[in-house]
Amino acid sequence: EEELQVIQPDKSVSVAAGESAILHCTVTSLIPVGPIQWFRGAGPARELIYNQKEGHFPRVTTVSESTKRENMDFSISISNITPADAGTYYCVKFRKGSPDTEFKSGAGTELSVRAKPSAPVVSGPAARATPQHTVSFTCESHGFSPRDITLKWFKNGNELSDFQTNVDPVGESVSYSIHSTAKVVLTREDVHSQVICEVAHVTLQGDPLRGTANLSETIRVPPTLEVTQQPVRAENQVNVTCQVRKFYPQRLQLTWLENGNVSRTETASTVTENKDGTYNWMSWLLVNVSAHRDDVKLTCQVEHDGQPAVSKSHDLKVSAHPKEQGSNTAAENTGSNERNIYGGSG
């Protein structure tokens, strides 16, 4: 009778994580008597996966009735495969004895595990940035196998090109991680914008995973200020308004100064939202000009989102009472301690 051969017909087997892997092995002879063992890897550090003779291998089942003498099929099924199970598996015939001695090994079957990447997590900068600045976004996904993966960046559906991507580790591993950093230039219209990281992998069957970041969490659009004097409502009264336009986020505090002295401070509450996601707000003062002997310098000072204050001033002439005056008129004044000013916002 010809000498026993150990046949492993599959050079490689690919299995999705969580599924069972069937590793085929047959022998060509019933001689010699002795057990079959399965190992992962070769050499002295090989890992025992299954021993026909003894041991407890809860994830391994034999495909056929391997306890019988006439059996020549020693294929096994390994349940609940994880990326850690990847490797080359050898079916090895031993000759019965004390100890059992290795008689012949199969050529090996390489098990590769297809593991899905985790949902991409996109994170932006720690601090807000203003339009025209470039900010970095990172995207991370972990636990996938095989190593081949595609990552794309989009801003509002438009593919970005300024990014760098790394897949780790560089060498062989049971699973891999991807890390990508994209650079995005902010515009004033980006409050409603989204940055999307899209990951495509063989395990996803053409349905890529996406992670998103809203630029509303990253952008700060500083306000523009306009101070105007409205027509006289009643004799000796002037309505001065401060228009705060196109700001984001909403966090804003406004202070009226009269000749450099704080008149009133208020926090933006009833704002109006623009189509681009920015906000507008208006505050007004009703000034009783008859209470002033000299010209009044009114300043609208705005502190937005904790940033240094910006301001706009308006010079209110009290020597004559025209129906309307323009804003931002430069004028020297000594200031006034009289407080006959009323305010509001809207």
Epitope: E1, L30, I31, V33, G34, P35, Q52, K53, E54, S66, T67, K68, R69, E70, N71, K96, G97, S98, P99, D100
Partner: antibody
Framework: EVQLVESGGGLVQPGGSLRLSCAAS????????MHWVRQATGKGLEWVSV???????YYPGSVKGRFTISRENAKNSLYLQMNSLRVGDTAVYYC????????????WGQGTMVTVSS | DIQMTQSPSSLSASIGDKVTITCRAS??????LAWFQQKPGKAPKSLIY???SLQSGVPSKFSGSGSGTDFTLTISSLQPEDFATYYC?????????FGQGTKLEIK
């Protein structure tokens, strides 16, 4: 049903010969090592011989050169040719199948009695 | 040849008892050890192979353990049908050899 049935036992004089048979059924006979085991009355079990799948044979010193094991796979039959019989060979002879992957016995016949006496 | 020594040679026990029979080999036999049960006038019945593997159809009250030279057979709760003679056997190499037997009797 897996079954082994021995036959051929009987009374024989010392120095005589006897041929035992074991008829196998219910399994692929050619795929198993087959053994003979004997048991003298009131005594323990003694292994007598084996024939492997490939026809290789082994015997203990007590019967070597006197007993010959053989098989006929086409007939699903196992044989034990016993020559130069001695009084000490008196026993019940069982055939057994090395049915496990490691050749452990799993199935036994009911036995046949061999008596060597003058 | 490898000698197999069983102890005790005989053992008296009651229904429901747990009993242990030991078997010692004169040299290392790995775990190629089988246990058989034999009742008077009957052929032996295979119980355990490779020291601890139960033959098909054998109840789980029988268990075996050991490796190398020292082995045990344990019957967890004796029933009337368990009173018999028990043999161990090494089958690591020819000639296969048996222990002398342990007769389990009812007390």
């Amino acid at each position: 049903e897996v079954q082994l049935v021995e036959s051929g036992g009987g009374l024989v004089q010392p120095g005589g010969s006897l041929r035992l048979s074991c008829a196998a059924s219910g399994f692929t006979f050619s795929s198993y090592d087959m053994h003979w085991v004997r048991q003298a009355t009131g005594k323990g079990l003694e292994w007598v011989s084996v024939i492997g799948i490939a026809g290789d044979t082994y015997y203990p010193g007590s019967v070597k050169g006197r007993f010959t094991i053989s098989r006929e796979n086409a007939k699903n039959s196992l044989y034990l040719q016993m020559n130069s019989l001695r009084v000490g060979d008196t026993a019940v002879y069982y055939c057994a199948r090395g049915g496990s992957w490691d050749d452990a016995f799993d199935i036994w016949g009911q036995g046949t009695m061999v008596t060597v006496s003058s | 040849d490898i000698q197999m020594t069983q102890s005790p040679s005989s053992l008296s026990a009651s229904i429901g008892d747990k009993v242990t029979i030991t078997c010692r080999a004169s040299q290392d036999i790995n775990n190629y050890l089988a246990w058989f049960q034999q009742k008077p006038g009957k052929a032996p019945k295979s119980l355990i192979y490779t020291a601890s593997s139960l033959q098909s159809g054998v109840p789980s009250k029988f268990s075996g353990s050991g490796s190398g030279t020292d082995f045990t057979l344990t019957i967890s709760s004796l029933q009337p049908e368990d009173f018999a003679t028990y043999y161990c056997q090494q089958y690591v190499s020819y000639p296969y050899t048996f222990g002398q037997g342990t007769k389990l009797e009812i007390k």
